[in-house]
């Protein structure tokens, strides 16, 4: 059982544990999300992503979650259960990112660019909200990310 993001294979990640970690904090996160009209991981970001694109996109999205979302939210929360869940998610995201090596070859430029444009849509939506709201919404949308990642899961 592994993820196949196009040519990028990821082993050793157990999706069940990611879901368990997310569900442990889901109600808290989504209850704190007051801006229900907006969505960060909108349709245009995740719809019809090709296998070739998927490696670039998941790499940039998970790196953003690690460097911006988990890192900042970690400093804002004190509840042990919440911290434990975020640690589980973050550790698994690190494991995924560490195994992703998107090709930097010139012939992949258009695919890389397409994935980057998708990521920019997500980042733009994130930056339009104030920091607290953006972090909360991003964490509340981890289920959207995990559901999309299922498309690249192999039994």
């Amino acid at each position: 059982q592994e993820f196949h993001f196009g040519p990028c294979q990821v082993k050793g990640v157990v999706p069940q544990k990611l879901w368990e970690a997310f569900w442990a904090v889901k109600d808290t996160m989504q209850a704190q999300d007051n801006i229900t009209s907006a969505r960060l991981l909108q349709q245009e970001v995740l719809q019809n992503v090709s296998d070739a694109e998927s490696c670039y996109l998941v790499h940039t999205l998970l790196e953003f979650y690690l460097k911006t979302v988990f890192k900042n939210y970690h400093n804002r929360t004190v509840e042990v259960r919440t911290l434990k869940s975020f640690s589980t998610l973050a550790n698994n995201f690190v494991l995924i990112v560490s195994q992703l090596q998107p090709s930097q070859e010139n012939e992949m430029f258009s695919i890389r660019d397409s994935a980057h444009r998708r990521f920019l849509l997500f980042r733009r939506a994130f930056k339009q909200l104030d920091v607290e709201a953006a972090l909360t919404k991003a964490l509340g949308e981890v289920d959207i990310l995990l559901t999309w990642m299922q498309k690249f899961y192999k039994l």
Partner: antibody, heavy 119, light 106 residues
Framework: EVQLVESGGALVQPGGSLRLSCAAS????????MSWVRQAPGKGLEWVSH????????FYAESMKGRATISRDNAKNTLYLQMNSLKSEDTAVYYC????????????WGQGTQVTVSS | SYELTQSPSVSVALRQTAKITCGGD??????VQWYQQKPGQAPVLVIY???RRPSGIPERFSGSNSGNTATLTSSGTQAEDEADYYC?????????FGGGTHLTVL
Amino acid sequence: EVQLVESGGALVQPGGSLRLSCAASGFTFDDYAMSWVRQAPGKGLEWVSHISGNGFSTFYAESMKGRATISRDNAKNTLYLQMNSLKSEDTAVYYCAKDDYGSGLYAYWGQGTQVTVSS
Amino acid sequence: SYELTQSPSVSVALRQTAKITCGGDNIGSKSVQWYQQKPGQAPVLVIYADSRRPSGIPERFSGSNSGNTATLTSSGTQAEDEADYYCQVWDSSVAVFGGGTHLTVL
């Protein structure tokens, strides 16, 4: 080899209660989320409930909220569905299913147990 | 709540191609599973994650998913493919099944 064996189905009167069991083998039970799915006579599949591998997270279909409780005993490799205030529309074959992703990827199913609610 | 729409029945001539569709709002962003069920039997997973085939499922079964429609295709349909087929997704902590399509092989 993955095996799921349901039991506990019976004929019960409206308003009655029933506890279904699903004995699992062939995989590390507590690593996987599990679900109950039912099928009324001549009808389609209807998801009933879901429980995470650690048992901490549970979800229910609207039709069963407040009347059903899903649980698991990881030491016994067994999944349960406690149903109360049963109605005639709960008559169905109840299947337990192993979730291979954690959010509705049912690669393995039991053979089902028949629940009939009738006076 | 999320809904999936399937046409109740599809007919196909033996060894021809059958297409069964599943409609849902922005289903293309969700991961779609397809199950085959024969009378008196439990469902069997035939396609998962839109287009992946579990081991043991014949190569004639394939899947696609884009926009508001997911499609299960049986190329060179065999008599034993006659069954009910259900699409399924996960949405907001709920598993959702389509109403089912009965495939008749003529």
